[in-house]
């Protein structure tokens, strides 16, 4: 990423902090939080922006978990442990030695316990659904519309590859996006469901991390797309490993 | 086919007002970002405006800020400029054009220019 | 940044292959050719990449890092014109070009 040297800005990442002094003078930006690099060209991941966001508090939200079969980010935010890459570590632990394994989005998906929980593997969520209700409009969105302009918001604005939209469903006012991506889908440079369905809700709420523009401007021929509330669920290529105790 | 076509040009005198009218055809106008540019005599492009298909964003380059307008009228297809204070470097060929990337976080970038106008000319001179 | 960097001239003979570079933008590029000035530029790529489905294959784009790259394979006698980059820059949240690259056909 390269700008005016007096005053360089990451385009893709509000949470930064940026300054001129990469190779040629050229801009480089580092991860509130963190402090690692990020590359502005495209999305930065999901685990240096909670981190990024936990460095500067806000109230922490909550979901509700509507399937035992879906994760829903019920814990709200905790600052993540990221690996070198920027991805969610897969054993999270807070200050009390509370430990957790968590997927690819930093969703938990196992009880809680103590510095002995082992996590062997960073498990991939492969599937997002996330499930919007819009405000109420003159009349129902045209389908087609709703979904050219859905798929279209997720390739132009987060580059994500239009084969990893799985498909949009519309029953009004209910509004819902398949994002899937196995791990054998997603090649060097793809973006990340999880990073594009986080930058998405975050667009959503009002608190785009894009610098510029900011924020979005969603319509269906002309007819603002206004969404008051959103639940994503994410599923994993492995089930998570919850105790009975949790399931009633 | 897609076209735009500039209107309003002509010789104009410093510290007036010009309104330049750019009409499309041949494409959903609603659904694209719109951008001015110009040319002056001799010299490179400038970018100079962009309108998103909304109409609720504009953004303006630092040599006509605070001085241009940019507008559009998505039920006639039809983007305007208001430039005012005119000066002796407003002196150009001001073309219309379209954005290919109305969602994009970049979508005020020139990279997404895919349709131009022939233009219109501009002299501002006493 | 004033506007994006690019090589003032370029100079080739038929058949040869050409590259453009265009740097100092945050984000996509776009590579128009003007054959004369007033006249309105044609555009031969734009978002990067992306060629319009009248310009001849011999055009492409790409982009590395923050560097995009205008390439005609087998350059024409007619292909003879000044190329402009357009870009944006993140440090302004506007579009820019560049000072425009003058190619000749030898």
């Known amino acids: 990423h390269t700008a005016a040297q007096d005053n360089c800005t990451c385009p893709t990442n509000k949470m930064t902090v940026c300054s001129p002094d990469g190779p040629g003078g050229r801009c480089q930006c580092r991860a509130l939080g963190s402090g690692m690099a990020v590359d502005c060209s495209t999305l930065t991941s999901k685990c240096l922006l909670l981190k990024a966001r936990m460095s500067a508090p806000k109230n922490a939200r909550t979901l509700v978990r509507p399937s035992e079969h879906a994760l829903v980010d019920n814990d709200g935010l905790y600052d993540p442990d990221c690996d070198p890459e920027g991805r969610f570590k897969a054993r999270q632990c807070n200050q009390t030695s509370v430990c957790w394994c968590v997927n690819s989005v930093g969703v938990r998906r196992t009880d809680k316990g103590d510095l002995s929980l082992r996590c062997d593997e960073l498990v991939r969520t492969h599937h997002i659904l996330i499930d919007l209700r819009h405000r109420p409009t003159a009349g129902a969105f045209n389908h087609s519309d709703l979904d050219a302009e859905l798929r279209r918001l997720f390739r132009e604005r987060y580059r994500l590859h239009p084969k990893f939209v799985a498909a949009v469903h519309y029953e009004q006012p209910t509004i819902q996006i398949e994002l899937r991506q196995n791990t054998s889908q997603k090649a060097a440079g793809d973006v990340d469901i999880g990073d594009a369905a986080y930058y998405f809700e975050r667009d959503i709420k009002g608190e785009s991390l894009f610098q510029g523009r900011g924020g979005l401007d969603l319509r269906v021929r002309g007819e603002p797309l206004q969404v008051e509330r959103t639940l994503i669920y994410y599923l994993d290529e492995i089930p998570p490993k919850f105790s009975m105790k949790r399931l009633t | 086919a897609v076209t735009l076509d500039e209107s309003g040009g002509g010789l104009q005198t410093p510290g007036g007002g010009l309104s330049l009218v750019c009409k499309a055809s041949?494409?959903?106008?609603?659904?694209?970002?719109m951008f001015w540019v110009r040319q002056a005599p001799g010299k490179g492009l400038e970018w100079v405006a962009v309108?998103?298909?909304?109409?609720?964003?504009?953004n303006y380059a630092p040599a006509v800020k605070g001085r241009a307008t940019i507008s559009r009228d998505n039920g006639q297809s039809t983007l305007r400029l208001q430039l005012n204070n005119l000066r002796a470097e407003d002196t150009g060929t001001y073309y219309c054009?379209?954005?290919?990337?109305?969602?994009?976080?970049?979508?005020?970038?020139?990279?997404?220019?895919?349709?131009w106008g022939h233009g219109t000319e501009v002299i501002v001179s006493s | 940044a004033l506007a994006l960097t690019q090589p003032s001239s370029v100079s080739a003979n038929p058949g040869e292959t050409v590259k453009i570079t265009c740097s100092g933008g945050s984000g996509s590029y776009g590579w128009f050719q003007q054959k004369s000035p007033g006249i309105a530029p044609v555009i031969v790529i734009?978002?990067?990449?992306n060629r319009p489905s009248d310009i001849p294959s011999r055009f492409s784009g790409s982009k590395s890092g923050s560097t995009g790259t205008l390439t005609i394979t087998g350059v024409q006698a007619e292909d003879e014109a000044v190329y402009f980059c357009?870009?944006?820059?993140?440090?302004?949240?506007?579009?820019?070009f560049g000072a425009g690259t003058t190619l000749t056909v030898l």
């Open positions: 054009a379209r954005g290919a990337c109305t969602h994009c976080w970049d979508a005020d970038s020139a990279g997404y220019i895919d349709t």
């Open positions: 309108i998103n298909r909304s109409g609720s964003y504009t």
């Open positions: 734009f978002n990067d990449d």
């Open positions: 041949g494409f959903d106008f609603i659904d694209y970002d």
């Open positions: 357009g870009g944006y820059d993140g440090s302004t949240d506007a579009g820019i």
